[in-house]
């Protein structure tokens, strides 16, 4: 035990991908504990990560209730129970987070090519519709369920034997592209929300190439 003053949290930062949302802050606590509260602009404050010595708090369960709402969090600092505080009395120190609107700001996770199928000179490329932690009627929604036509995918494809890339876009999770007969192609996809001003694009998916296991080749 000892005497100390609490210090306010700082560098409050939202880390969010496909709606999995964590608030991070500094500093590592010394003789103090934290409690996080989260609220919408019109709602009541709700305590999360109560009495914690962590410097992160998973707020996913709260923000998925309505991903189009704007949220504000605040991190309170309290003296630990072994501390005889010398500081002034009064309200606990706290720091506000930036505002966070999940629908507009969550990062798009790296997509995955689920499969590709060649039929003659056409190839159908399917992007995995990743599940999110957003629920409706007790089932988890996919990324497509949440974003609808706001979400598009860009396909980058090229002949294995060359470096010249072509692109295609879709507002579903499937592409149908023309290819040259007898050529092997490689594919990579990227998720995009064109209407956004920040976090518009995901990282590119891992590259998948024809002649490997994911695809199916049918000679017509």
């Amino acid at each position: 035990s000892g005497t100390t003053n609490t210090v306010a949290a700082y560098n409050l930062t939202w880390k969010s991908t496909n709606f999995k949302t964590i608030l991070e802050w500094e500093p590592k606590p010394v003789n103090q504990v934290y409690t996080v509260q989260i609220s919408t602009k019109s709602g009541d404050w709700k305590s999360k990560c109560f009495y914690t010595t962590d410097t992160e708090c998973d707020l996913t369960d709260e923000i998925v209730k309505d991903v189009k709402q704007t949220y504000l969090a605040r991190v309170f600092s309290y003296p630990a129970g072994n501390v005889e505080s010398t500081g002034s009395a009064g309200e606990p120190l706290y720091e506000n987070s930036p505002e966070f609107t999940p629908y507009l700001e969550t990062n798009l996770g790296q997509p995955t090519i689920q499969s590709f199928e060649q039929v003659g000179t056409k190839v159908n490329v399917t992007v995995e519709d990743e599940r999110t932690l957003v629920r409706r009627n007790n089932t988890f929604l996919s990324l497509r369920d949440v974003f609808g036509k706001d979400l598009i995918y860009t396909l980058y494809y090229w002949k294995s034997s060359s470096s010249g890339k072509k692109t295609a876009k879709t507002n579903t999770n499937e592409f149908l592209i023309d290819v040259d007969k007898g050529e092997n192609y490689c594919f990579s996809v990227q998720a995009v929300i064109p209407s956004r001003t920040v976090n518009r694009k995901s990282t590119d998916s891992p590259v998948e190439c024809m002649g490997q296991e994911k695809g199916e080749f049918r000679e017509i």
Epitope: S47, K48, F50, F76, Y78, P79, A89, E91
Partner: nanobody
Framework: AVQLVESGGGLVQPGGSLSLSCAAS????????MGWYRRSPGKERELVAV???????HYGDFVKGRFAISRDNVKNAVYLKMNFLTPEDTAVYYC????????WGQGTQVTVSS
């Protein structure tokens, strides 16, 4: 300064129950954490239970579901219901209100003995 006054301590047999109360002399903001700590002879003060203004709770590891903390924000009070008491629960129990600093009550003695 905030004054905290505990009551409800006393002598109880093993396996018995006891209820502690703590009232604050002035209004306690709902942003304060209120709770209970205890100190046994020759030991450090340890957390028993704490509660937020909106009713979120946290208990010391030794509690194991035996105790329940509650809070009345209107009465500026915090309560601790203790069940299945053992001699190891013998201690002075202190009320705490934590805001920018810790505020402590004078403590109330709980003795568990046959």
């Amino acid at each position: 300064a905030v004054q905290l006054v505990e009551s409800g301590g006393g002598l109880v047999q093993p396996g018995g129950s006891l209820s502690l109360s703590c009232a604050a002399s002035e209004m306690i903001s709902s942003t304060y954490i209120m709770g209970w700590y205890r100190r046994s002879p020759g030991k450090e003060r340890e957390l028993v239970a704490v509660i937020s203004g909106d009713g979120v709770t946290h208990y010391g590891d030794f509690v194991k579901g035996r105790f329940a903390i509650s809070r009345d924000n209107v009465k500026n009070a915090v309560y601790l219901k203790m069940n299945f008491l053992t001699p190891e629960d013998t201690a002075v129990y202190y009320c705490n209100a934590a805001g920018r600093r810790n505020h402590w009550g004078q403590g109330t003695q709980v003795t568990v003995s046959s």
